[in-house]
C-alpha cells in the first residue's frame, strides 16, 4: 500500500480467483484513543472499533472511503483505490490501446519543434468518474525537471457504437537546450483513476523522435508565362525552431488530381519553392520534415490549381 496523495492510498492487488488479498491496517488520524468506530462509504454498518482497523482487501468491493468516527463526529478519512495485477500484468482497462506505432501504445506524444515543449494525448471510452495526473522528467535516475499542465478533454468522437474521449496535456522541459544532442530520454507518467481503480501509464522518448512540424505556411502559386507550369512557394511554419539555417526542413510537393486514383506527382526539395505542372482540377500540397533526422512529416498544406 502507498499514498497517492493526502488521505488517498493505492493497494496493489495480485488478483486471481481465491487469492487471499492484501491485509491493510488503517489508522485513524486523531489523538483520541477510545470510542472510535469505522464505516465504509455511505453505509452506517460499523466495520470495527478502535484507533486502527485491519481489513483484507480482495476485490473492489473492499475499496472505497473508510471513515473513523467518534460520537457522531467524523475524525478522518482514508480512500482506498485498487491497482490490480492479473497474470503478472498490471491492468490497462482505463485507456485504449492506440496500436500506433506499435501495440500497447497508450500514450502518444508530439513536439512541433526542439524547444522542449511537447503534447501527449490518450484515448478512453469512459466518460465519468475519471481523473488524470501527469508527471514528467528527463531521465529517471537523476531526473531533470519537466513541467506539465493539467490534462484536459480535447476531443470527443463516435466510433461505431462507442463514444471515444481524447485527453491531452502540454509539458515543457524546464531547462531545454534545443541544439544539444539528447542522451537521456523524456519520461512521461500518467496516473489514471476511474471510480476505485488506479492505473499508471508511461512513455519514454527523445524529443527528436517525436518531432512533427506544423504544415508549411503561406502556400502560394505563381503561374509561369506561356506554360502549364506554376511556381509554388511557401514559408517555414511559425512554430518551427530558429535559426532555420541550423534547424532546417526538407519539403515534399505533391500534385494530386481530383480523383484519388490519379497518379500523384511528387517533388522533394530543401528550398521553399518548386516548379510543377498544374493540371486542371488538381491541387498542390506541401509538407515538411526535419532535414537531418527522419521524424514525422507534417500534415499537408494545400491550394487548388485553378
Amino acid at each position: 500500500i502507498w499514498e497517492l496523495k493526502k488521505d488517498v492510498y493505492v493497494v496493489e492487488l495480485d488478483w486471481y480467483p481465491d487469492a487471499p488479498g492484501e491485509m491493510v491496517v488503517l489508522t485513524c488520524d486523531t489523538p483520541e484513543e477510545d470510542g472510535i468506530t469505522w464505516t465504509l462509504d455511505q453505509s452506517s454498518e460499523v466495520l470495527g472499533s478502535g484507533k486502527t482497523l485491519t481489513i483484507q482487501v480482495k476485490e473492489f468491493g473492499d475499496a472505497g472511503q473508510y471513515t473513523c468516527h467518534k460520537g457522531g463526529e467524523v475524525l478522518s478519512h482514508s480512500l482506498l483505490l485498487l491497482h490490480k495485477k492479473e497474470d503478472g500484468i498490471w491492468s490497462t482497462d482505463i485507456l485504449k490501446d492506440q496500436k500506433e506505432p506499435k501495440n500497447k501504445t497508450f500514450l502518444r506524444c508530439e513536439a512541433k519543434n526542439y524547444s522542449g515543449r511537447f503534447t501527449c494525448w490518450w484515448l478512453t471510452t469512459i466518460s465519468t468518474d475519471l481523473t488524470f495526473s501527469v508527471k514528467s522528467s528527463r531521465g529517471s535516475s537523476d531526473p531533470q525537471g519537466v513541467t506539465c499542465g493539467a490534462a484536459t478533454l480535447s476531443a470527443e468522437r463516435v466510433r461505431g457504437d462507442n463514444k471515444e474521449y481524447e485527453y491531452s496535456v502540454e509539458c515543457q522541459e524546464d531547462s531545454a537546450c534545443p541544439a544539444a544532442e539528447e542522451s537521456l530520454p523524456i519520461e512521461v507518467m500518467v496516473d489514471a483513476v476511474h471510480k476505485l481503480k488506479y492505473e499508471n501509464y508511461t512513455s519514454s522518448f527523445f524529443i527528436r523522435d517525436i518531432i512533427k512540424p506544423d504544415p508549411p505556411k503561406n502556400l502560394q502559386l505563381k503561374p509561369l508565362k506561356n506554360s502549364r507550369q506554376v511556381e509554388v512557394s511557401w514559408e517555414y511554419p511559425d512554430t518551427w525552431s530558429t535559426p532555420h539555417s541550423y534547424f532546417s526542413l526538407t519539403f515534399c510537393v505533391q500534385v494530386q488530381g481530383k480523383s484519388k486514383r490519379e497518379k500523384k506527382d511528387r517533388v522533394f526539395t530543401d528550398k521553399t519553392s518548386a516548379t510543377v505542372i498544374c493540371r486542371k482540377n488538381a491541387s498542390i500540397s506541401v509538407r515538411a520534415q526535419d532535414r537531418y533526422y527522419s521524424s514525422s512529416w507534417s500534415e499537408w498544406a494545400s491550394v487548388p490549381c485553378s
Epitope: W15, P17, D41, E59, F60, G61, E86, D93, T125, I126, G160, D161, N162, K163, H194, K195, L196, K197
Partner: nanobody, 123 residues
C-alpha cells in the same frame, strides 16, 4: 447507456440445470465487466458471480462455486449464467448488471441493471 434484458428463468426440480441469458443493447458491450446477482423475497440482493470484459476471468460467490458458470459472447452482446445442481435455496429473481470494476461483489459498483428473471427450484 446500456440496456440489459434477462431471459431463461423458470421452474425446475432440485438437481436440474438452467441457463440464463442477458442481452445487452446500447453502448459497446465489450467495454463492461458483467455480473449476476440474485434476490430472494425479504432478503438483500446477493452477488452470484462476475466476468471480466474479455471473458478471460470469472469470480464467484462461495455459495455457487463449482455449480454455476458465467460466460459471455461479445459478438452477440450476451452474457450467460449456466446453473447446475440447483437447490431450493437458489430460488430468487436473478439480475444481470454491467459495470467498470472487476472483480467486485458489491452491487453499487455496477452502473446498469436488468429487470430480472424469476428462477424457482422446487424440492
Amino acid at each position: 447507456e446500456v440496456q440489459l434484458v434477462e431471459s431463461g428463468g423458470g421452474v425446475v426440480q432440485a438437481g436440474e440445470s438452467l441457463r440464463l441469458s442477458c442481452a445487452a443493447s446500447g453502448r459497446s458491450f465489450s467495454n463492461y465487466e458483467m455480473g449476476w446477482f440474485r434476490q430472494a423475497p425479504g432478503t438483500e440482493r446477493e452477488f452470484v458471480g462476475s466476468i471480466n470484459r474479455r471473458g478471460s476471468s470469472t469470480y464467484y460467490a462461495d455459495s455457487v462455486k463449482g455449480r454455476f458458470t458465467i460466460s459471455r459472447d461479445n459478438a452477440k452482446n450476451t452474457v450467460y449464467l449456466q446453473m447446475s445442481s440447483l437447490k431450493p435455496e437458489d430460488t430468487a429473481v436473478y439480475y444481470c448488471a454491467a459495470g467498470w470494476l472487476y472483480p467486485s461483489s458489491r452491487s453499487r459498483d455496477y452502473d446498469y441493471w436488468g429487470q430480472g428473471t424469476q428462477v424457482t427450484v422446487s424440492s
